[in-house]
């Protein structure tokens, strides 16, 4: 089942997924000047058995100049409701993202390939946030996006991670990060893809070297 | 389910300080931030400030900045919200607002500044 | 700081009715915005968030538009128990400021 919104967008922050759920899809799509071969697919397709998951079809892109010059089209087909926009930069990858049973890696770049990649996100997926350059997490709350489906319908829930700017913030002397939450977290805000932890740990680390680890942007 | 609930109705002089507490039940505290938003009477609503429950770091809008002090004690699930050198025009009351989007409120705290 | 117009500033309505609340900001916010309800003596209630995405437990009648600078509420069949102050608000950085708000009556 596709999400029917984009994952919600967080104010001076970026996300991405570590890993695609099977039954996702990557619009197969060319940089200026270049298009899809004729007969190649319209997307790549997370697919997969128990025991292993890859991408589907493979998208290749030719020459528009190449006889007909005909504009490049968006493949929308009517049933994929869901645009994830993303800008590509080199793919280095989180080391727990290949052994996730049911979930791709992210596909490696194709020849002349946009800019940007538009994913077609399906329900059970999760992504993770995180705050640009130059901003700060004031507060690290679960910083992750997860689309549900509920009474029939498909939504993603909220993160709670603030962004901000402002380096004049109350720190009170002494007071120390809790090491863990008192209470559980309920059974619906879990997930089994990367622990809330980990991630803490990756944007920790994150913040403190001032590198991204995410390999794509999201917009 | 989420509940939470703020400390009762305050009088107070003027120059005098007001400590006011939301306590949080019903999931996982430090997971949420917590907002302070004040409504004097027959007014609009007063964003004043954001507490990381987590960190306890605090950012304070900046008609408050100076006066207001927001912490927090993860051990009761309480946030706290210091407002001094009272002046009748803090006669207000005073909520407390959970995470990004404010979905769960307190029920209020009125607070009367009054000689 | 970010400024927050609504408009109206009060209106009366019939139940049955379709109302449209609107609400402008000073910049853009993209789509960090919030609408909530409030009745008199009451806590606000979060009706919608992140401009369009209905809060639960909230009523299908209700719905929200917009992004950048200009933002609407609407409340598709007006129910005797919507009366109340609306409020919209930017989350998009600090400080979080609220709209002037929006009194709805029922004729």
């Known amino acids: 089942e596709l999400c029917d919104d984009d994952p919600p967008e967080i104010p001076h922050a970026t996300f991405k997924a570590m890993a695609y759920k099977e039954g996702t899809m990557l619009n197969c799509e060319c940089k200026r000047g270049f298009r899809r071969i004729k007969s190649g697919s319209l997307y790549m397709l997370c697919t997969g058995n128990s025991s292993h998951s890859s991408w589907d079809n493979q998208c290749q892109c030719t020459s528009s100049a190449t006889r007909n010059t005909t504009k490049q089209v968006t493949p929308q087909p009517e049933e994929q409701k869901e645009r994830k926009t993303t800008e590509m930069q080199s793919p280095m990858q989180p080391v727990d993202q290949a052994s996730l049973p049911g979930h791709c890696r992210e596909p490696p770049p194709w020849e002349n390939e946009a800019t940007e990649r538009i994913y077609h996100f399906v329900v059970g997926q999760m992504v993770y946030y995180q705050c640009v350059q130059g901003y700060r997490a004031l507060h690290r709350g679960p910083a992750e996006s997860v689309c549900k489906m509920t009474h029939g319908k498909t939504r993603w829930t909220q993160p709670q991670l603030i962004c901000t700017g402002e380096m004049e913030t109350s720190q009170f002397p002494g007071e120390e990060k809790p090491q863990a939450s008192p209470e559980g977290r309920p059974e619906s805000e879990t997930s089994c893809l990367v622990t809330t932890t980990d991630f803490q740990i990756q944007t920790e680390m994150a913040a403190t070297m001032e590198t991204s680890i995410f390999t794509t942007e999201y917009q | 389910q989420v509940q939470l609930v703020q400390s009762g109705a305050e009088v107070k002089k003027p120059g005098a300080s007001v400590k006011v507490s939301c306590k949080a039940s019903g999931y996982t505290f430090t997971d949420y931030a917590m907002h302070w938003v004040r409504q004097a009477p027959g007014q609009g609503l007063e964003w004043m400030g954001v507490i990381s429950t987590y960190s306890g770091d605090a950012i304070y809008a900046q008609k408050f900045q100076g006066r207001v002090t927001m912490t927090r004690d993860t051990s009761t699930s309480t946030v706290y919200m210091e407002l001094s050198s009272l002046r009748s025009e803090d006669t207000a009351v005073y909520y407390c607002a959970r995470g990004v989007t404010f979905d769960y409120w307190g029920q209020g705290t009125t607070v009367t500044v009054s000689s | 700081d970010i400024q927050m117009t609504q408009s109206p500033s009060s209106l009366s309505a019939s139940v049955g009715d379709r109302v449209t609340i609107t609400c402008r900001a000073s910049?853009?916010?993209?789509?960090?915005l919030e609408w909530y309800q409030q009745k008199p003596g009451k806590a606000p209630k979060l009706l919608v968030y992140?401009?369009?995405t209905l809060a639960e437990g909230v009523p299908s009648r209700f719905s929200g538009s917009g992004s950048g600078t200009d933002f609407t509420l609407t409340i598709s069949s007006l129910q005797p128990e919507d009366f109340g102050t609306y409020y919209c608000?930017?989350?998009?950085?600090?400080?979080?400021?609220f709209g002037q708000g929006t009194k709805l009556e029922i004729k």
């Open positions: 992140n401009a369009k």
């Open positions: 910049q853009d916010i993209s789509n960090y």
């Open positions: 608000q930017h989350h998009y950085d600090t400080p979080y400021t």
